[in-house]
């Protein structure tokens, strides 16, 4: 009679994490008598996975009924596969012996690889805001995937970025892997509504990549432009001076009026106008009682935006151009008309 052969028909199989793996093994003869054992690995360090005769293997079930007299199918099913189960599995026939069974023949082995999905990519930007024309770095991380091969792309508003560096760790063997990528993005004044997207493609995702996003609104600071103008005279001794604060982001803004270098009023921006590009405009005005001044007045609009050093714009108010009337009711006190509206939206 022909000598028994142990047949493992699958050279390799690939299973998704969490699923069951079926490892096929058949023998070609019922002789010699003796059990089958399954091992992961070979040589003296091999690990027993299943023993037909003894032991407790809670994750392993046999595909066939091994108690049947003529059974030649010794395939097993391993449940709830994790990346740690990867390796080469050998079906080994033992010959009945005393006191121990003797290894008789081994199958050629089945390599089990485990597919594990990457976690949702997490994109994080710089800790501090940056202004247009500056380059900022974004990082993208995804973990827990297997096999190691993975593709990562960066986009800004749908346009693919090319300035990035990606590492997959560890460099050597592991049950699962992580990817870390850093992209450099140049900010523009129009980026308040922009998004940076990290896209990860992996064999486990069936062509439907995972995406992580970051809004540039969390990263960008667009500093305001200031314009101070003198409006036509509203009353005989009053001049309306406005400070237009334009195209700034984020909203956090404090404005201070200075009269000849002295603080006259401080206010926090409210009732802002939003531009199409996501930046804001705001206007503050001031009524100046000209008759209270003998000399020319230097009015300064000073703006502190998002905690940054203040920027300012000044306007010289010529008092000589407004002759004082003796009968005007100019009460002593501040030259700013406190009864006037303090601000408004422009």
């Amino acid at each position: 009679e022909e000598e028994l052969q142990v047949i493992q028909p699958d050279k390799s199989i690939s299973v998704a994490a969490g699923e069951s793996a079926t490892l096929h093994c058949t023998v070609t003869s019922l002789i010699p008598v003796g059990p089958i054992q399954w091992f992961r690995g070979a040589g003296p360090g091999r690990e027993l996975i299943y023993n037909q005769k003894e032991g407790h293997f809670p994750r392993v079930t046999t595909v066939s009924d091994l108690t049947k007299r003529n059974n030649m199918d010794f395939s097993i099913r391993i449940s709830n596969i994790t990346p740690a189960d990867a390796g080469t599995y050998y079906c080994v026939k033992f010959r009945k012996g005393s006191p121990d069974h003797v290894e008789f023949k081994s199958g050629a082995g089945t390599e089990l690889s485990v597919r594990a999905k990457p976690s949702a990519p997490v994109v994080s930007g710089p800790a501090a805001r940056a202004t247009p024309q500056h380059t900022v770095s974004f990082t993208c991380e995804s973990h827990g995937f297997s096999p190691r091969d993975i593709t990562l792309k960066w986009f800004k508003n749908g346009n693919e970025l090319s300035d990035f560096q990606t590492n997959v760790d560890p460099a050597g063997d592991s049950v699962s892997y992580s990817i870390h990528s850093t992209a450099k993005v140049v900010l523009t004044r129009e980026d308040v509504h922009s998004q940076v997207i990290c896209e990860v493609a992996h064999v486990t995702l069936q062509g439907d990549p995972l995406r992580g996003t970051a809004n540039l609104s969390e990263t960008i600071r667009v500093p305001p432009t200031l314009e101070v103008t003198q409006q036509p005279v509203r009353a005989e001794n009053q001049v309306n001076v406005t400070c237009q604060v334009r195209k700034f982001y984020p909203q956090r803004l404090q404005l201070t009026w200075l009269e000849n270098g002295n603080v006259s009023r401080t206010e926090t921006a409210s009732t802002l106008t939003e531009n199409k590009d996501g930046t804001y405009n705001w206007m503050s005005w001031l009524l100046v009682n000209v008759s209270a001044h003998r000399d020319d007045v230097k009015l300064t609009c000073q703006v502190e935006h998002d905690g940054q050093p203040a920027v300012s714009k000044s306007h010289d108010l010529k008092v000589s151009a407004h002759p004082k009337e003796q009968g005007s009711n100019t009460a002593p006190g501040p030259a700013l008309a406190s009864a006037a509206p303090l601000g408004g939206s422009g």
Epitope: G41, A42, G43, G45, R46, Y90, V92, G107, A108, D173
Partner: antibody, heavy 122, light 112 residues
Framework: QVQLQESGPGLVKPSETLSLTCTVS????????WSWIRQPPGKGLEWIGF???????FYQSSLKSRVTISLDTSKNQFSLKMTSVTAADTAVYYC????????????????WGQGTTVTVSS | DIVMTQSPLSLPVTPGEPASISCRSS???????????LDWYLQRPGQSPQLLIY???SRASGVPDRFSGSGSGTDFTLKISRVEAEDVGVFYC?????????FGQGTKVEIK
């Protein structure tokens, strides 16, 4: 093509610990045994021990109390630590890969590092 | 431990001529599966050893076919059908059936 590279100090003082690292490049750690073998000057080969990819270790019984082999699969490296060295430990130390296809035995030490000379002297 | 014994310890050879090295193990290297756990290595001067033969008779990748291994149980032979100048060095047999792995003392092959 798999290559192995030993690294570590060439000179160790008596009673100190010898530490060597072997870096595996161009291949996988999985399914192989990773071995340390030494060759004293003018003598034959002596197996020190090996580690399987699953972390199981096997040592030469005469060296077992002094030797530890460890594996860092994430870096594709394995290491040898030998404590309380004496002049008798002076040798060329090789790291090597041992194949295991099936069964209980092994299928040849098929890849060797170039060897690193370790001298034990004060 | 399995003891490996080689003979001769020194072998002067003539290029183009055949050569033979014997190796004996203190216990059988033929496993119950029918596999022989016996390997042959060549260490050229100043180099690391290289695997020539594994499993008693299988040539390792890239090894010229002038090298052949035979034998089973406890007695093994490495044959070189036609010695070439590059074959000089020390030949070792080694067993891989059980730990500790052990090697023969080595056979030094040199040109006459």
């Amino acid at each position: 093509q798999v290559q192995l590279q030993e690294s570590g100090p060439g000179l160790v003082k008596p009673s100190e610990t010898l530490s060597l690292t072997c870096t595996v490049s161009g291949g996988s750690i999985r399914d192989y045994y990773w071995s340390w073998i030494r060759q004293p000057p003018g003598k034959g080969l002596e197996w020190i021990g090996f580690i399987y990819y699953n972390g199981r270790t096997f040592y030469q019984s005469s060296l077992k109390s002094r030797v530890t082999i460890s594996l860092d699969t994430s870096k594709n490296q394995f290491s040898l630590k030998m404590t309380s060295v004496t002049a008798a430990d002076t040798a060329v130390y090789y790291c090597a890969r041992v194949r295991a296809y099936s069964g209980i035995g092994l299928d040849g030490t098929d890849v060797w590092g170039q060897g690193t000379t370790v001298t034990v002297s004060s | 431990d399995i003891v490996m014994t080689q003979s001769p310890l020194s072998l002067p050879v003539t290029p183009g001529e055949p050569a033979s090295i014997s190796c004996r193990s203190s216990q059988s290297l033929l496993y119950s599966t029918g596999y022989t756990y016996l390997d042959w290595y060549l260490q050229r001067p100043g180099q690391s050893p290289q695997l020539l033969i594994y499993g008693g008779s299988s040539r390792a990748s890239g090894v010229p076919d002038r090298f052949s291994g035979s034998g089973s149980g406890t007695d093994f032979t490495l044959k070189i059908s036609r010695v070439e100048a590059e074959d000089v060095g020390v030949f070792y047999c080694g067993q891989a059936l059980q730990t500790p792995l052990t090697f023969g003392q080595g056979t030094k092959v040199e040109i006459k």
